[in-house]
């Protein structure tokens, strides 16, 4: 089966790569503006050059391309914790990411919000913070993971999960209550 | 203590709109970014939409781009999601909510109210 092809993807294999299949008269193929411009105009004939301009501060095009108008220029969430790491340029997009000892969390493709990285109190560090992923905590003997916290069994009720983990701590306390009833 | 009570929610034909409201209390509403979550039935949560304090640049999931728009009102401790050009897979049950703060998790949502966009 042959995959479907956009439009635009037709007329761009119909001509080697780097070249574009011209708008108005498919027999001419036009060479691709570089990353960092936009197409201004089309080429007026075969051999010869395609009009392509820088694209203005706050846009960019980050590869060569058939674009009649540069791209926006992202801007960091400041209320997401996001900070800027690099800043846009007429060929890269602006580059957003978090502060030392934090973490991205991806809510959907193109939003991410910082974070702490735990720090792992009342427990170990399995593993440690990485770019896209908080620390993973080990508990110590008496606590639960709970939020990514490790949390004392003291404040485990008996329809959480961590009843398993903190067993013998429900028991004593079960155990307590009922020495206390008369 | 917190409380956020979404309503507006119904049953509204293809095409439609509807106005969905929340009012905030138990907390300075101004000082928050607040959040419109989503979750379709056997579904998981989805981000929706969400505005800062002064109401600047307010994001949109892609999904939403260009029908919906969300807005709030600091003098009356109140958010809105104005849904334009509803879709049969806009349907779900919305929830508002305090921007997390200390991981992602909502520690304050709503209860909810849903939309059903059905002909």
């Known amino acids: 089966l042959v995959p479907h092809l956009g439009d635009r993807e037709k007329r761009d294999s119909v001509c080697p790569q780097g070249k574009y299949i011209h708008p108005q008269n498919n027999s001419i193929c036009c060479t691709k503006c570089h990353k960092g411009t936009y197409l201004y105009n089309d080429c007026p004939g075969p051999g010869q050059d395609t009009d392509c301009r820088e694209c203005e501060s706050g846009s960019f095009t980050a590869s060569e391309n058939h674009l009649r108008h540069c791209l926006s220029c992202s801007k960091c969430r400041k209320e997401m914790g996001q900070v800027e790491i690099s800043s846009c340029t007429v060929d890269r997009d602006t580059v957003c990411g978090c502060r030392k000892n934090q973490y991205r969390h991806y809510w959907s493709e193109n939003l991410f919000q910082c974070f702490n990285c735990s720090l792992c109190l009342n427990g170990t560090v399995h593993l440690s913070c990485q770019e896209k992923q908080n620390t993973v905590c080990t508990c110590h003997a008496g606590f639960f993971l709970r939020e990514n916290e490790c949390v004392s069994c003291s404040n485990c009720k008996k329809s959480l999960e961590c009843t398993k983990l903190c067993l013998p701590q429900i028991e004593n306390v079960k155990g307590t209550e009922d020495s206390g009833t008369t | 203590e917190v409380q956020l009570l979404e309503s507006g929610g119904g049953l509204i034909q293809p095409g439609g709109s509807l106005r969905l409201s929340c009012a905030a209390s138990?907390?300075?509403?101004?000082?928050?970014?607040m959040v419109w979550v989503r979750q379709a039935p056997g579904k998981g949560l989805e981000w929706v939409s969400h505005?800062?304090?002064?109401?600047?640049?307010?994001y949109y999931a892609d999904s939403v781009k260009g029908r919906f728009t969300i807005s709030r009102d600091n003098s009356k401790n109140t958010l809105y999601l104005q849904m334009n050009s509803l879709r049969a897979e806009d349907t779900a049950v919305y929830y508002c909510?305090?921007?997390?703060?200390?991981?992602?998790?909502?520690?304050?949502r709503g209860q909810g109210t849903l939309v059903t966009v059905s002909s």
């Open positions: 138990g907390f300075t509403f101004a000082h928050e970014t």
């Open positions: 909510a305090l921007l997390p703060k200390r991981g992602p998790w909502f520690d304050y």
């Open positions: 505005i800062d304090r002064v109401g600047q640049d307010p």
